[in-house]
Interface confidence: low
């Protein structure tokens, strides 16, 4: 009878195993092993008993030992099990920002690890397990399904193999997986609110904001403000679940014309874009041109207003015979149009809004030296003694220099409160002197004597 | 300033292919660029454009048969899976400096011809 | 789905004279139209932008009109080298809509 030591042996895989070969008759014919694994004999004393060294095991392995006696040949295996931890445990790849709401499909695949009857798979968030499978088939997969909610934001998961040997003596080999860090989002189907001026002037600013409401986590929202293909710096402040992006944005000559305001909110793997068209315009203020500012008493006098050629104008509350961008006014010019405002108005259309530009510019008209008699009498009698101001007013563009002489030296005292005297008496030559001329007028003072009773 | 496209060919159905426009002159980061096609004696369709930021937009013909992505001196236009009906010079052209617009085009490439053929 | 009709498809005219090419739109752009012309071998050239305005370099030959959904390109005082095909392009609205479009050409043979 023939029989083998260990009959089952565990070993890690490699490995190297001792094996005893007996057989109960004295003088065995035949004592030997049978297997395809490198074997190296000990030489023992006897003829009954034989050691073999089998090693580098790498599969599950049945040697066989053999002996021929007398009463014929018989044969017992022994069992040869081996161990290994599993060469990859893997969590198929997935996009680290996930949807709320969304169905996560978490795969783990296992290649490698015996014996198979010892090894389990478990799925797992954070400590939490959420599924256990025996690995199966080569690669093991082991899947499930989570439904993605806002607090998984951050959460880890990963992929176990358990290698349970305890039962056969052993200890419990775990192999874990690198973790996949979930980053959840929400980003509303609604897109972004976009608030700005619908028309810009060039070489003016103006402000954009750009604001959306339930966001998570709102922190990680990426905000990209452009008008046309110039890119605006926002500051943007955040609530809970809200943010509200504002850009100072300056406008040039070179960007005159119809421009697209782009706001674009990118959040996890999703974007929501709102698009707006702002009108950028040139349109100075109107032009007011005098044919002279300052002109004679007399003269004709041009006024025009010049504005954008699209702008439609008012000169002085007329509006431009025919409706447009130009109009003006003929006049001769009197005393009374000396300081005349000429205001022109220009109205310009630009996206379906009314833009005011205003220009004025004042006439300066020369005339005079004028002396009449309502500012300059020709003729006083006051009583002696009394206290009077003699007026006289000289009129004028600019304003005239007065005197008024009695035999061409004795001044009559204008505008000044003087005692009424005889030697105040007499005719006098008022003389008003301007750059535009010259004129005369004679003033006779009379002094009343005072009767004596 | 000036554009040039590169790496048209032959080549046979269903083998991916990517055209290169490279630019000089001016910054990418500044403008949006256009890709338009014009097959042999016909007319001019618009592909999609990429914005300064990277950003690429499609029109609704062109959605999943092309890609366009850019480094800083280059945009590049991928067919995904050409057919015969791919067959077509293909333009890169900026826009974005009257009114702003992406879609007003005042610079163009010369074309490249791409013939695909089994 | 945005369409840009142009007609005629070819016209033909002598030196010294007028043509006129129509650009319709299914729907309202606004005065968002472009022309551009383009010769043999070569790529287009911008000729007109916001339906009117000229863009730099270009011959005042050259005359854009129209607003809405009906446009049109006026080359007055014909030359040969005017000879040419002429697209016209929609850039309102967004890519999926009607930017971008361009219409189908009118080929401008001058005899």
């Known amino acids: 009878q023939t029989s083998v030591s260990p009959s089952k042996v565990i070993l890690p895989r490699g490995g190297s195993v001792l094996v005893t070969c007996s057989t109960s008759c004295d003088q065995p014919k035949l004592l030997g092993i049978e297997t395809p694994l490198p074997k190296k004999e000990l030489l023992l004393p006897g003829n009954n008993r034989k050691v073999y060294e089998l090693s580098n095991v790498q599969e599950d392995s049945q040697p066989m030992c053999y002996s021929n006696c007398p009463d014929g040949q018989s044969t017992a295996k022994t069992f040869l099990t081996v161990y290994w931890t599993p060469e990859r445990v893997e969590l198929a790849p997935l996009p680290s920002w996930q949807p709320v709401g969304k169905n996560l499909t978490l795969r783990c695949q296992v290649e490698g690890g015996a014996p198979r009857a010892n090894l389990t798979v478990v799925l797992l968030r954070g400590e939490k397990e959420l599924k256990r499978e025996p690995a199966v088939g080569e690669p093991a997969e082991v899947t499930t399904t989570v439904l993605v909610r806002r607090d998984h934001h951050g959460a880890n998961f990963s992929c176990r193999t358990e290698l349970d040997l305890r039962p056969q003596g052993l200890e419990l080999f775990e192999n874990t997986s690198a973790p996949y860090q979930l980053q959840t989002f929400v980003l509303p189907a609604t897109p972004p609110q976009l608030v700005s001026p619908r028309v810009l002037e060039v070489d003016t600013q103006g402000t954009v904001v750009c604001s959306l409401d339930g966001l998570f986590p709102v922190s990680e929202a990426q905000v990209h403000l452009a008008l046309g293909d110039q890119r605006l710096n926002p500051t943007v402040t955040y609530g809970n679940d809200s943010f509200s992006a504002k850009a100072s944005v300056s406008v040039t000559a070179e960007d005159e014309g119809t421009q697209r305001l782009t706001c674009a909110v990118i959040l996890g793997n999703q974007s929501q874009e709102t698009l707006q068209t702002v009108t950028i315009y040139s349109f100075p203020a109107p032009n007011v041109i005098l044919t002279k500012p300052e002109v004679s008493e007399g003269t004709e006098v041009t006024v025009k207003c010049e504005a954008h050629p699209r702008a439609k104008v008012t000169l002085n509350g007329v509006p431009a015979q025919p409706l447009g961008p130009r109009a003006q006014l003929l006049l001769k010019a009197t005393p009374e149009d000396n300081g005349r405002s000429f205001s022109c108005s220009a109205t310009l259309e630009v996206a379906g809004q009314l833009i005011h530009k205003n220009q004025t510019r004042e006439l300066r008209v020369l005339y005079g030296p004028r002396l009449d008699e309502r500012d300059c009498p020709g003729n006083w009698t006051w009583p002696e003694n009394s206290q009077q101001t003699p007026m006289c007013q000289a009129w004028g563009n600019p304003l005239p220099e007065l005197k008024c002489l009695k035999d061409g030296t004795f001044p009559l005292p204008i505008g000044e409160s003087v005692t009424v005297t005889r030697d105040l008496e007499g005719t006098y030559l008022c003389r008003a002197r301007s750059t535009q001329g010259e004129v005369t007028r004679k003033v006779t003072v009379n002094v009343l004597s005072p009767r004596y009773e | 300033q000036s554009l040039e496209e590169s790496g048209g060919r032959l080549v046979t159905p269903g083998t991916p292919l990517t055209l290169t426009c490279t630019v000089s002159?001016?910054?990418?980061?500044?403008?949006?660029m256009s890709w338009v096609r014009q097959a042999p004696g016909k007319g001019l369709e618009y592909i999609g454009w990429?914005?300064?930021?990277?950003s690429a937009y499609y029109a609704n013909w062109a959605k999943g048969r092309f890609t366009i992505s850019k480094t800083s001196t280059t945009v590049d236009l991928k067919i995904t899976s050409p057919t015969t009906e791919d067959t077509a010079t293909y333009f890169c052209?900026?826009?974005?400096?009257?009114?702003?617009?992406?879609?007003?085009?005042?610079?163009w490439g010369p074309g490249t011809l791409v013939t695909v053929s089994s | 789905a945005f369409e840009l009709t142009q007609t005629p498809s070819s016209v033909e005219a002598a030196v010294g004279g007028t043509v006129t090419i129509k650009c319709q739109a299914s729907?309202?752009?606004?005065?968002?139209l472009s022309w551009y012309q383009q010769k043999p071998g070569q790529p287009p050239k911008l000729l007109i932008y916001?339906?009117?305005t000229l863009a730099s370099g270009v011959s005042s030959r050259f005359k854009g009109s129209g607003s809405g959904t009906e446009f049109t390109l006026t080359i007055s005082d014909l030359e040969s080298a005017d000879a040419a095909t002429y697209y016209c392009?929609?850039?309102?609205?967004?890519?999926?809509?009607?930017?971008?479009?361009f219409g189908g050409g009118t080929e401008v043979v001058v005899k």
């Open positions: 052209a900026r826009g974005g400096d009257y009114g702003g617009s992406t879609y007003i085009l005042n610079l």
């Open positions: 002159g001016f910054s990418l980061s500044s403008y949006g």
């Open positions: 990429i914005s300064f930021s990277g």
């Open positions: 729907e309202s752009i606004d005065s968002y």
């Open positions: 916001a339906a009117s």
């Open positions: 392009q929609s850039y309102s609205g967004t890519i999926t809509t009607s930017g971008g479009a």
